[in-house]
Amino acid sequence: LPAQVAFTPYAPEPGSTCRLREYYDQTAQMCCSKCSPGQHAKVFCTKTSDTVCDSCEDSTYTQLWNWVPECLSCGSRCSSDQVETQACTREQNRICTCRPGWYCALSKQEGCRLCAPLRKCRPGFGVARPGTETSDVVCKPCAPGTFSNTTSSTDICRPHQICNVVAIPGNASMDAVCTSTSPTRSMAPGAVHLPQPVSTRSQHTQPTPEPSTAPSTSFLLPMGPSPPAEGSTGD
């Protein structure tokens, strides 16, 4: 004959544990039913009656099988620099993540507690490391032969155009200006190419000179929510 299935509440056999979705109630000394996600325990079990569960009320939740007396409160509404990627429901907490152009400066178990705007590299500086969901942009000065004339959290240092005849030589924040003869592009030393589109101009190709072996003077600025460092702007 098959063994009798015990219905909650029941006293467990000595040395055995309660079954899945049950808990041992110390007061009743019985195995009792847990409440499902979206519920909480309204009345705890006794020797003769099982747990009475109730719905999680507005803006509260439980994500797991439980016997908590009250559901957990959902986090506060997402701030203006965030987007709600998961709504508050009776079975899950609200999750806020940073909107585009921002990164998470202070994370929490799920989602983000504090978002900060991505650092913008000012003219003469380009993006050395792009921002991610959880890290800020790292700027670096444009190496000789490269420039950036924008204030941007995405633009890298681009190579100066190579002129047959230079009208105005380029610097870290300005491209070279050529006389009327057609310019060509060079991969100058220290030019960084990040995996993102870079605006190109129509140009004649010409063999590029061998890169110089001179050491690069570029450096990385610290990551994280630090005050605007050299080469970056908080705007």
Partner: antibody
Framework: QVQLKESGAALVKPGASVKMSCKAS????????VSWVRQSHGRSLEWIGE????????NFNEKFRGRATLTVDKSTSTASMELSRLTSEDSAIYYC???????????WGPGTMVTVSS | NIVMTQSPTTTAASPGEKVTITCLAS?????IYWYQQKSGASPKPLIY???SLASGVPDRFSGSGSGTSYSLTINTMEAEDAATYYC?????????FGSGTKLEIK
């Protein structure tokens, strides 16, 4: 599209029980709790209870605990409610509704008319 | 149980007129939900979480309020808005509904 189809009207005697069903379609049945709400003639709405097809757990309005039995059949995406010890006060339209993942009822069935009369 | 008191019980409005229905809770609630029920039909959600419009609801409907006092506003009444409106809370179990406001067209 989400649809909730309820069983037909019932005429029952006082003291008896009535069982009604609600077949869901157009969404994943186990993703939402199913609630039962009644509306007595010309009166407001009254929540009876709800069941989770996913967890097979129930919540009740204390007024109906012990008198209402909620069940689900996942294989046919059908929720059922049995109400026992009926009195004339139980004459009403009984609606099944899908409880939104939050705290309101976003889709409703057409209702089942229950008349309790000797 | 939280008691939801709606006012007015019945009202009538001309097309184009602004209509406001209020709902008072017997104790503070976090949110309110509004439903529209036309004669012989099932209730249909209008507003959820106090002020968010349910799917397919025209933007002439809006909701506001906090604590114990909430309201539903129809900015410009249309003939199809003639119905009974109910508020509902679920800040305390069990969820409870208001007694309804019947809105007629003049």
């Amino acid at each position: 599209q989400v649809q909730l189809k309820e069983s037909g009207a019932a005429l029952v005697k006082p003291g008896a029980s009535v069982k009604m069903s609600c077949k869901a379609s157009g969404y994943t049945f186990t993703d939402h709790w199913v609630s039962w709400v009644r509306q007595s003639h010309g009166r407001s709405l009254e929540w009876i209870g709800e069941i989770s097809p996913n967890y097979d757990t129930t919540n009740f309005n204390e007024k109906f605990r012990g008198r209402a039995t909620l069940t689900v059949d996942k294989s046919t995406s059908t929720a059922s409610m049995e109400l026992s010890r009926l009195t004339s006060e139980d004459s009403a339209i009984y609606y099944c509704s899908r409880t939104n993942s939050g705290w309101y009822f976003d889709f409703w069935g057409p209702g089942t008319m229950v008349t309790v009369s000797s | 149980n939280i008691v939801m008191t709606q006012s007015p019980t019945t009202t009538a409005a001309s097309p184009g007129e602004k209509v406001t229905i209020t709902c008072l809770a017997s104790s503070s609630v976090r949110n309110i939900y509004w439903y529209q029920q036309k004669s012989g039909a099932s209730p249909k959600p209008l507003i959820y979480s106090t002020s968010s419009l349910a799917s397919g609801v025209p933007d002439r409907f809006s909701g506001s309020g906090s604590g114990t006092s909430y309201s539903l506003t129809i900015n410009t009444m249309e003939a199809e808005d003639a119905a009974t409106y109910y508020c509902q809370q679920w800040s305390r179990n069990p969820p409870t509904f208001g007694s309804g406001t019947k809105l007629e067209i003049k």
